[in-house]
């Protein structure tokens, strides 16, 4: 990969091992856990990153109300099965043969079942709502400055095409970033909104996935934007299928 040529590292993914063992002795970086070669000029898929994380050695309302079908990732970390493209397989199972269906960002979208559970297709998450609360500041941020800074961040740091950042809402101290990307809109080479959101989430938590870069230093007109809480909602092209018991719990 040209991005990794000089000193054989992967700028966009620190969860890799790079070696001059590619064709012609070129640098090749493979994701930990899966062993899949990754493209270091762009973001690595969330599935491969989660797998790498699990395998790494243990060291007036302008705000959007999430739809009733919005999913939150309550299950936390698991060791996912990724397909040869690096995407989540539609059905995930744990070591005890408990299985469930996931969406394209790896979030569970059905009740848990056994090995007989069928997940016919990987349902695409087409709308992601990132809900942030920032630490108290002297005054509110200017909305248009905040909007511009967050759009710049997603464009430059995560290489997400600007058309996929649908909106930035602000009602102090809550910021909401809406990412939208339908299957038909996503062209070859486009960063997936799910991958961009995952990189952003890790950055916000101070767990940057980028190699050797400093952590995320978000500033709006020189004023630090420090996030104290993050919630991410995922909306799928097909609504999730949970039992009524879960919905009323």
């Amino acid at each position: 990969h040209t991005a990794a040529q000089d000193n054989c590292t992967c700028p966009t993914n620190k969860m890799t091992v790079c070696s001059p063992d590619g064709p012609g002795g070129r640098c090749q970086c493979r994701a930990l856990g899966s062993g899949m070669a990754v493209d270091c000029s762009t973001l690595t898929s969330k599935c491969l990153l989660l797998k790498a994380r699990m395998s790494a050695p243990k060291n007036a309302r302008t705000l959007v109300r999430p739809s009733e079908h919005a999913l939150v990732d309550n299950d936390g970390l698991y060791d996912p099965d990724c397909d040869p493209e690096g995407r989540f397989k539609a059905r995930q199972c744990n070591q005890t043969s408990v299985c469930w269906c996931v969406n394209s960002v790896g979030v569970r979208r059905t009740d848990k079942g056994d090995l007989s559970l069928r997940c016919d297709e990987l349902v695409r998450t087409h709308h992601i709502l990132i809900d942030l609360r920032h630490r108290p500041t002297a005054g509110a941020f200017n909305h248009s400055d905040l909007d511009a800074e967050l759009r710049r961040l997603f464009r430059e740091r995560y290489r997400l095409h600007p058309k996929f950042v649908a909106a930035v809402h602000y009602e102090q101290p809550t910021i909401q970033i809406e990412l939208r990307q339908n299957t038909s809109q996503k062209a070859a080479g486009d960063v997936d909104i799910g991958d961009a959101a995952y990189y952003f989430e890790r950055d916000i938590k101070g767990e940057s996935l980028f190699q050797g870069r400093g952590g995320l230093d978000l500033r709006v007109r020189g004023e630090p934007l420090q996030v104290e809480r993050t919630l991410i909602y995922y909306l799928d092209e097909i609504p999730p299928k949970f039992s009524m018991k879960r919905l009323t719990a």
Epitope: S19, D21, A37, P84
Partner: antibody, heavy 116, light 113 residues
Framework: QVQLVQSGAEVKKPGASVKVSCKAS????????LGWVKQAPGQGLEWIGN????????NYNEKFKGKATITADTSTSTAYMELSSLRSEDTAVYFC?????????WGQGTLVTVSS | DIVMTQSPDSLAVSLGERATINCKSS????????????LAWYQQKPGQPPKLLIY???TRESGVPDRFSGSGSGTDFTLTISSLQAEDVAVYYC?????????FGQGTKLEIK
């Protein structure tokens, strides 16, 4: 030139352990993946696992977890694979190999025979 | 795991004739990031370690005679020996090194007819 030289043949009793070595020379040992492959008599090839000596990352084929333990000593450019609780079905030739798209370098193989 | 299936299991070809071995994988071996197929072909003679012939589905390893060629992409691959020589008698294996665990085909035994 790149060379991988493995330790000699071993005969072991069931239940015993064996440690096979693979000494690398002719390249920088720490920056290439090194894998281990099993070939039972008259059978095909099975990938056991690999190690990246520079950072000691190790991957195992699920089938060999608990059976094989892969390690490396960077000071001597030597990789090791220990097989535990030997049974007759562990009788095989074990190869080490430098991995990669164009890494056609294999050790000569080590025959491990398990017999009572 | 990715399952590699070779056909035929054995093959007898006359000297100077073309030999063709097929390999089918249960999942695509094409990496969309770099458009590389993670498929290698090995030749193994009795009492010897496997010898790398082809990597990346179609790139010949240095020193390998040009009568050996590899083709295919995704899930279907072919090793072709354009004009069989006596020294080509061996067992041939395809291998995926796309995603762990790396897997080999069951092997194809090539003999002289």
């Amino acid at each position: 030139q790149v060379q991988l030289v493995q330790s000699g043949a071993e005969v072991k009793k069931p239940g015993a352990s064996v440690k096979v070595s693979c000494k690398a020379s002719g390249y920088t040992f720490t920056i290439y993946w090194l894998g281990w492959v099993k070939q039972a008599p008259g059978q095909g090839l099975e990938w056991i696992g690999n190690i990246f000596p520079g950072s000691a990352y190790i991957n195992y084929n699920e089938k060999f977890k608990g059976k094989a333990t892969i390690t490396a000593d960077t000071s001597t450019s030597t990789a090791y694979m220990e097989l535990s609780s030997l049974r007759s079905e562990d009788t095989a030739v074990y190869f080490c190999a430098r991995e990669g798209s164009n890494s056609g370098y294999w050790g000569q193989g080590t025959l491990v025979t398990v017999s009572s | 795991d990715i399952v590699m299936t070779q056909s035929p299991d054995s093959l007898a070809v006359s000297l100077g004739e073309r030999a063709t071995i097929n390999c089918k994988s249960s999942q695509s071996l094409l990496n969309s990031g770099n458009q590389q197929n993670y498929l290698a072909w090995y030749q193994q003679k009795p009492g010897q370690p496997p010898k790398l012939l082809i990597y990346g589905a179609s790139t010949r390893e240095s020193g390998v005679p040009d009568r050996f060629s590899g083709s295919g992409s995704g899930t279907d691959f072919t090793l072709t020996i354009s004009s069989l020589q006596a020294e080509d008698v061996a067992v041939y294996y395809c291998q995926s090194d796309h995603i762990y665990p790396y897997t080999f085909g069951q092997g194809t035994k090539l003999e002289i007819k």
